[in-house]
């Protein structure tokens, strides 16, 4: 007499999360009586998928007639695939008894699930950073299958070279996770960039998943402090300009200062943007120079976006009298800058 | 080629509980079961325990009131827990691999962690 | 639970020499589907176990062919044809038929 043969035929099969997965089994005999049972995984902990005899399998239908006389296809058709369903399947038959005695399994078919990745998501940094300082950015994708994903970097359409990607598990799961670290050099014209991480895998069928991160959220963009005084009025007021240039994000505070003491304080608001995303503001101090006796030190102090003050101090001599007062321009200074201007009566 | 890396405290007092853990690199927890095994100073080998991939565990009845193995497959880890230690705990430790092919059967523990020494003392 | 009793409990040989050790169990490891569930493994000196046989005959990946396993139902043997010196540390058999896996008392060769 012939030994009975369980046959899977195939060794793996790959199916689509919420397709169906068809796996095969037959067996060489009607002999000796006794029902094919399925099971996911093998020794004491594996699961019955399906047994035609008993139980309720709803997910699981006979691909042909079991109840059919000869029938020798025992095989199975699984619905509505998720990733849990990964695994090894057994086709086993059983001697007829009490209870039914195993006799012989299948070789078993590996399943595989092909999962799509969720859409990137992109995090930055929790505080700003200046430009010319590095930050980084992570990207996230979760619960796909297989493993094998690729995942790119871009700033404003260039390539990012300088990322660390990870993929988790390290052996084979039921599905994986991605993260991907990407570090990026800001520069002062990067208000208006776009970092965008991109996720390439078998289930896209070439149309890749992007997640983005505005590096306006990320950046912090210091002002340029130009103060310039105007031409001496008739009236003996001196006009001086603080110039706040290229500054991001909106939110500055101004403060004028005569002889230390606060003159004015102004706060940015309804700012027109500038083509490369920052903006410029300019405040107006008037200074009578006839109602002092002494010098005047005038201070423009500018607080942007919570960042220690930045200060332009000048003085108002009193006791020269020139009547032809030029423009006098302080150059770009981070600290403190004084200057003379001379200033009189008349 | 599969590793198997156990980590945890090499002191434990008596009464508190032992936490190990065991992590597996380079392979795939799918299609296999994660045994404890552990071998007290100059004697044999004991079995405490097994997962599944599923989550299904298998205790040893003389420690199973004591011993919870659990499976982490986003890390790629299985712990075990053993509560209420006693002198009689101290032993080498071992995390393993354990095959199953066909039937209700198993095919080989054929990966060991190199075990970690565990002392019960006050 | 199944007991497994091993003999001898230690073993003297010579490098070169055949060498056998017994295995047997409280009831059949013998399953139905034909397959007998005894496993053999080595724990070298300061070292883990190692994987020998399993189902009783066949031999794990990397092991030498000095190594074989006999038996079915409650009596099991382990040969080595020819014994080396790296053979030495304490060989054990354990079923794996059903939980709790239980191991026996353990055999330790040493050379002679």
């Known amino acids: 007499e012939e030994e009975l043969q369980v046959i899977q035929p195939e060794k793996s099969v790959s199916v689509a999360a919420g397709d169906s997965a068809t796996l095969n089994c037959t067996v060489s005999s009607l002999i000796p009586v006794g029902p094919i049972q399925w099971f996911r995984g093998a020794g004491p902990g594996r699961e019955l998928i399906y047994n035609l005899k008993e139980g309720h399998f709803p997910r699981v239908t006979a691909v042909s007639d079991p109840t059919k006389r000869n029938n020798m296809d025992f095989s199975i058709r699984i619905s509505n695939i998720t990733p849990a369903d990964a695994g090894t399947y057994y086709c086993v038959k059983f001697r007829k008894g009490s209870p039914d005695v195993e006799l012989k399994s299948g070789a078993g078919t590996e399943l595989s699930v092909r999962a799509k990745p969720s859409a990137p998501v992109v995090s930055g940094p929790a505080v700003r950073a200046t430009a010319e300082h590095t930050v980084s950015f992570t990207c996230e994708s979760h619960g796909f299958s297989p493993r094998d994903i690729t995942l790119k970097w871009f700033k404003n359409g260039n390539e990012l070279s300088d990322v660390q990607t990870n993929v988790d598990p390290a052996g084979k799961s039921v599905s994986y996770s991605i993260r991907s670290t990407a570090r990026v050099l800001l520069t002062r014209r990067d208000v208006h960039s776009q970092v965008i991480c991109e996720v390439a895998h078998v289930t896209l069928q070439g149309d890749p998943l992007r997640g983005t991160a505005n590096l306006s959220e990320a950046i912090r963009v210091p002002p340029f402090l130009e103060v310039t005084q105007q031409s001496m009025r008739a009236d003996n007021q001196v006009n001086v300009t603080c110039q706040v240039t290229k500054f991001y994000p909106q939110r500055l505070q101004l403060t004028w200062l005569e002889n230390g003491n606060v003159s004015r304080t102004e706060m940015a608001s309804a700012l027109p943007e500038n083509k490369d995303g920052t903006y410029n503001w300019t405040s107006w101090l008037l200074v009578n120079v006839s109602a002092h006796r002494d010098d005047v030190k005038l201070t423009c102090q500018v607080e942007h976006d919570g960042q220690p003050a930045v200060n332009k101090s000048f003085s108002v001599k009193v006791s020269a009298h020139p009547k032809e007062q030029g423009s006098n321009t302080a150059a770009e200074n981070t600290g403190t800058n004084e200057r003379n201007i001379y200033g009189g009566s008349g | 080629q599969v590793q198997l890396q156990e980590s945890g405290p090499g002191l434990v007092r008596p009464s508190e509980t032992l936490s190990l853990t065991c992590t597996v690199s380079?392979?795939?927890?799918?299609?296999?079961?994660w045994s404890w095994i552990r071998q007290p100073p100059g004697k044999g080998l004991e079995w405490m325990g097994f997962?599944?991939?599923?989550?299904?565990?298998f205790y040893n009845p003389s420690l199973k009131s004591r011993v919870t193995i659990s499976l982490d497959m986003s890390m790629n880890q299985f712990s075990l827990k053993m509560t209420s230690v006693t002198a009689a705990d101290t032993a080498v430790y071992y995390c393993?691999?354990?095959?199953?092919?066909?039937?209700?059967?198993?095919?080989?523990?054929?990966?060991w962690g190199q075990g970690t020494t565990v002392t019960v003392s006050s | 639970d199944i007991v497994m009793t091993q003999s001898p409990l230690s073993l003297p040989v010579t490098p070169g020499e055949p060498a056998s050790i017994s295995c047997k169990s409280s009831?059949?490891?013998?399953?139905?589907?034909?397959?007998?569930?005894l496993d053999w493994y080595l724990q070298r000196p300061g070292q883990s176990p190692q994987l020998l046989i399993y189902?009783?005959?066949n031999r794990a990946s990397g092991v030498p062919d000095r190594f074989s396993g006999s038996g079915s139902g409650t009596d099991f043997t382990l040969k080595i044809s020819r014994v080396e010196a790296e053979d030495v540390g304490v060989f054990y058999c354990?079923?794996?038929?059903?939980?709790?896996?239980?191991f026996g008392g353990g055999t330790k060769v040493e050379i002679k």
């Open positions: 009831q059949s490891l013998l399953y139905s589907n034909g397959y007998a569930y």
């Open positions: 189902q009783g005959s």
């Open positions: 354990m079923q794996a038929l059903q939980t709790p896996l239980t």
């Open positions: 997962i599944y991939d599923n989550g299904r565990t």
């Open positions: 393993a691999r354990v095959r199953a092919y066909s039937g209700i059967g198993l095919d080989g523990t054929d990966v």
């Open positions: 380079g392979g795939s927890i799918r299609n296999y079961y």
